[in-house]
């Protein structure tokens, strides 16, 4: 049913959801730390605007009663429980930020007439694809999977002249909320990914995974995974592995690559890590400040959120219109807007998009290199180094297929 | 002794595109930052394009989503590819090289400088 939302007459409210159940285990003072510094820094905006408003929050705490696994598996009715909350007390705010398990976005996005902004830090699964008055500031499994179809596509570079068509899928239902999401659509028999590779395979358990790595009889050299160098160690160990494996291992939200005394140890080898570039400004166009690499992580993105809904309210109010409108819910996409660490770009559905950066382990110097990044916002790969200095022999990626000649 | 010598400049219709090398020798390119520098006619120098030693490119706004840096240590190059030039692009390009303190970040400022290119977009 319609909520009245207090977003008028100068006063401009966010509802922010604070649920117990979330895609990251970040202690809520902290993220409810992030809104706030966001908060002053858009009134701090909004002031130089010449724009005389106030702008709050109310975060809106679940019960923890019922839904209390902590993670994203209860949180589909959770969601629908605070905004019965918020109905009832009538607090509905100009937009709302949170949730963040793709379970509880989808179930409110369908359950409920959204007048309103829905800003999420996370919602990674294909099923928040394309919804019409969702913003997700965070990287989207429908991104993960476009740079992937590219890469595996891609046989021009200097160290990757062959296409590939296949890979295994290790997923074992033990994955974080982003990985969960990730692998989920990348084993979905309708996704993208899945209709552009001939031969796709998902590992379920640990001895199928330690079985490829040096079966002659496998069908692809390529495996991909999700998580950290420490969750690849205990699965994969010190074993062996044919020199023409490549792992494809997915950690987008973790910059401890970007740490300078990082030496990658030596299971990360045969390893190509998939992450985020940890920044790509140059502020003031110039060189004079050092750029150290910022967190990107959930925190970050309520912050952001909260800049977000800033932007769309200034731009709103200097052009006299009216914040409770459907034009002001479907207006946070297709847009640029100042992020708390450089600009921030979302695509026509709202999706947040980012440089994504592949790295690889120098055979040289056991440290950590950048071989290419990738731009979401244009489906683009750039080569960065040409002649990398990889275990692989020649220096090049191997075929997918082992024994079959250039394609 | 550390030298660096850019070329590839020219005279280029808008929307064209260039590719800059910066040839190194003296030193390993894993060892230092590479920054992109250019100077137009009466204004200051501005950076461009960073890669810090771990190869991580930087942009400056104004270029980002046109201009691409790569490097090939086994030939001792770095390139700067230029896309969608437009007339504001006009200027001396340098490369500029720094003793990497950090891998991941660009250095505050440049010891050691090419002799530049120049780079003229118009029609």
């Known amino acids: 049913s319609q909520v009245s939302q207090n977003c008028h007459n100068g006063s401009y409210e966010i509802s922010v959801l604070m649920m117990g159940n979330s895609a990251f285990a970040e202690p809520l003072k902290n993220l409810e730390d992030a809104v706030n510094e966001g908060l002053e820094i858009v009134r701090g905006r909004l002031q130089n605007a010449g724009l005389n408003v106030t702008v709050n929050a109310t975060f809106m705490y679940s019960d923890g009663l019922i839904h209390n696994s902590g993670d994203c598996r209860s949180s589909t009715c959770e969601g629908l429980d605070l905004l019965r909350k918020i109905s009832n007390a009538q607090r509905m705010g100009c937009v709302l930020i949170g949730p963040s398990c793709t379970y509880s976005t989808f179930q409110m996005y369908l359950d409920t007439e959204l007048s309103y902004p829905m800003i999420s830090a996370g919602s990674f699964g294909l099923s928040c694809d394309y919804k019409e008055t969702l913003t997700r500031l965070m990287s989207p499994a429908r991104k993960l999977m476009y740079f992937l179809v590219n890469f595996w596509k891609t046989n021009d570079l200097p160290f990757k002249t062959y296409s590939w068509s296949t890979s295994y899928v290790y997923k074992n239902g033990t994955e974080t909320e982003d990985c969960f999401w990730y692998l989920n659509a990348l084993e979905a028999s309708v996704s993208y990914f899945s209709h552009e590779l001939g031969f796709k395979v998902v590992l379920r358990q640990d001895k199928e995974f330690q079985d490829i790595l040096m079966d002659h009889n496998r069908k692809s050299n390529v495996i991909i995974m999700c998580g950290g160098p420490e969750f690849l160690y205990k699965l994969k160990g010190d074993r062996a592995v044919a020199e023409d494996i490549v792992i494809i291992l997915v950690d987008l939200f973790n910059d401890q690559y970007f740490e300078d005394n990082v030496t990658a140890p030596d299971y990360m080898k045969n390893v190509l890590v998939l992450t985020l570039s940890p920044g790509n400004s140059l502020l003031n166009s110039s060189f004079s400040r050092n750029l150290s690499p910022t967190k990107r992580d959930f925190a970050l993105a309520y912050l952001n959120g909260i800049l977000l809904f800033g932007h769309m309210l200034k731009i709103f109010l200097e052009n006299g219109e009216n914040i409770t409108t459907p034009k002001f819910a479907h207006a946070f996409r297709n847009l640029t807007f100042e992020g708390y660490d450089g600009p921030v770009t979302l695509d026509d559905w709202g999706d947040v998009d980012s440089t994504m950066v592949l790295l690889y382990t120098s055979v040289d110097t056991k440290k950590y290199k950048v071989l290419l990044t990738y731009d979401t916002h244009v489906n683009k790969t750039y080569p960065v180094d040409m002649s990398p200095t990889f275990t692989w022999k020649n220096s090049k990626l191997p075929n997918d297929i082992t024994g079959r000649g250039p394609q | 002794q550390l030298q660096l010598v850019e070329s590839g400049g020219g005279l280029v219709q808008p929307g064209g595109s260039l590719r800059l090398s910066c040839v190194t020798s003296?030193?390993?390119?894993?060892?230092?930052?590479i920054g992109w520098f250019r100077q137009a006619p009466g204004k200051e120098r501005e950076g461009v394009i960073c890669?810090?030693?771990?190869?991580?490119?930087k942009y400056a706004d104004s270029v980002k989503g046109r201009f691409t840096i790569s490097r090939d240590n086994a030939k001792n190059t770095v390139y700067l590819r230029m896309d969608s030039l437009k007339p504001d692009d006009t200027a001396v390009y340098y490369c500029?090289?720094?003793?990497?303190?950090?891998?991941?970040?660009?250095?505050?400022?440049?010891?050691?400088w090419g002799q530049g290119t120049q780079v003229t977009v118009s029609s």
């Open positions: 890669l810090t030693s771990g190869g991580l490119p």
């Open positions: 003296g030193f390993t390119l894993d060892d230092y930052a």
């Open positions: 500029a090289a720094s003793g990497a303190t950090s891998r991941w970040n660009c250095p505050p400022q440049y010891d050691h």
